[in-house]
Amino acid sequence: CRTSECCFQDPPYPDADSGSASGPRDLRCYRISSDRYECSWQYEGPTAGVSHFLRCCLSSGRCCYFAAGSATRLQFSDQAGVSVLYTVTLWVESWARNQTEKSPEVTLQLYNSVKYEPPLGDIKVSKLAGQLRMEWETPDNQVGAEVQFRHRTPSSPWKLGDCGPQDDDTESCLCPLEMNVAQEFQLRRRQLGSQGSSWSKWSSPVCVPPENPPQPQVRFSVEQLGQDGRRRLTLKEQPTQLELPEGCQGLAPGTEVTYRLQLHMLSCPCKAKATRTLHLGKMPYLSGAAYNVAVISSNQFGPGLNQTWHIPADTHTEPVALNISVGTNGTTMYWPARAQSMTYCIEWQPVGQDGGLATCSLTAPQDPDPAGMATYSWSRESGAMGQEKCYYITIFASAHPEKLTLWSTVLSTYHFGGNASAAGTPHHVSVKNHSLDSVSVDWAPSLLSTCPGVLKEYVVRCRDEDSKQVSEHPVQPTETQVTLSGLRAGVAYTVQVRADTAWLRGVWSQPQRFSIEVQVSD
């Protein structure tokens, strides 16, 4: 037989299908010009020493073969002995290792069999009513096709699906969308209405994320507040990466999950902007305020579930950084200014009450005064911190108050509001004899002691009613008792106690009279 012709003899190997898993498959035959034809196939398994034979049976029942050698593609003309106008059945037999392996048969009319391309170029993926919709431009001069898809997940094999007939300049397919796993899709086409025409090759992989992006499993830590009043938010655990099917590993456009960080600054609610969204890779610096932090995952189908954390406020207090002067017109606070043209947010709330009851005030941008201080004043009528109770005050600063991540904490401290001098006066002062020349003075703790760092000391004042001499005894703010010694028997004394803050002298308690009895010896 001539090599260019189909040989109508028995092939040079025994006629027996080994039924092995390897072998030829995906046979495609089509016209490539007015008088030339091509068949191609794939061979699965070791290729060394394999000879391929293209078999053809005519409608008359006569059969022939082409010897392709080790090639998996073969061209022939309409003069090769194969009927091109009538239906023929073709298959490939591969002779390897003393056994024959056969491909599935294709039955077609070669003249009308056109080589169809798979979807080429950009395949658009969208979600439609819980399903996946793929859309692509029909390859040139190939309108009218039957389309199939196959899909797999990282843990499942290929499954075949049908897209149905297409006959437009754009073709589309509805496919199943997985909720929680990524999928790889491939598409193939063949001529519509041409009985037995060959399928095109499979398209390049189309990688599709799950409908729900994976919930971010991340952990944060917050560093200590630095000298600049800011603390760094750091990511302790990176988000888990999506597991991808085999053909999507490496570069898999379409399955990307983007993680965004949404910051919500809970403190200082009177500022202009409370939330900011950032890329997860760019970890911000935060003030000492309280924040809610959400990590939002999203893919091409939109956002998924988010994970939210609460970052509590830094409660480290500066006992002396804030100076408060109370005058007839109102109250003024002074603190070390941060820089030129800073906006300050002063926030206060009664101690022991829910954070939602915080009040705040935003200053206009201000420069330091000649002493390098920033100030905030309010009138008594405003009612700010007017009640006689303990307030927690935090001052934040920013040169760009509209940018959430540029706030810093200037200071946090406690302040006793209202008329602290009078409200702090100790009550229930009592005097007990201690020895022949001393007494013990006790009192109930001042209300100022409920306000950390506010009560500087108690002062106990004793007055000799006769000589009018006075003594003053400083007492630690944690103590509510002092022993007065060196007293003289028979002298009439009065004792009073006051509670002082760093900048306010307290009001004396009501005088208590006492004396030490003169001891008469027998």
Partner: nanobody, 123 residues
Framework: EVQLVESGGGSVQTGGSLTLSCTAS????????VGWFRQAPGKEREFVSA????????YYSNSAEGRFTIAVDNAKNTVYLQMNSLNPEDTAVYYC????????????????WGQGTQVTVSS
Amino acid sequence: EVQLVESGGGSVQTGGSLTLSCTASGRTGSTDGVGWFRQAPGKEREFVSAIKWIGGSKYYSNSAEGRFTIAVDNAKNTVYLQMNSLNPEDTAVYYCAAGAIMFPSRPRDFDFWGQGTQVTVSS
């Protein structure tokens, strides 16, 4: 034995201020603290102010309270008396003394005395 040296006296106009210093040496730990007394010509020595070495308790006469402030620097064993709003009645020799601090204070409670420093207030 405790030695006491006063300084800071001088002349001042009515309404003026002076700060007196008293530096102690020797066995200061045997005393409660330091007191200031004054003696005007032809008058008895009178108590002005006192302070304890430990605890910082302060003592003032009726006339000194509100105008004078006593303070101690333990590291230097020095006691200071800051006198404001001085008037001619404050003219006297001011003595520093160390000893037991009783209340009310009297000169006889104090065992160790300095030489004194003159304060003159003119109108």
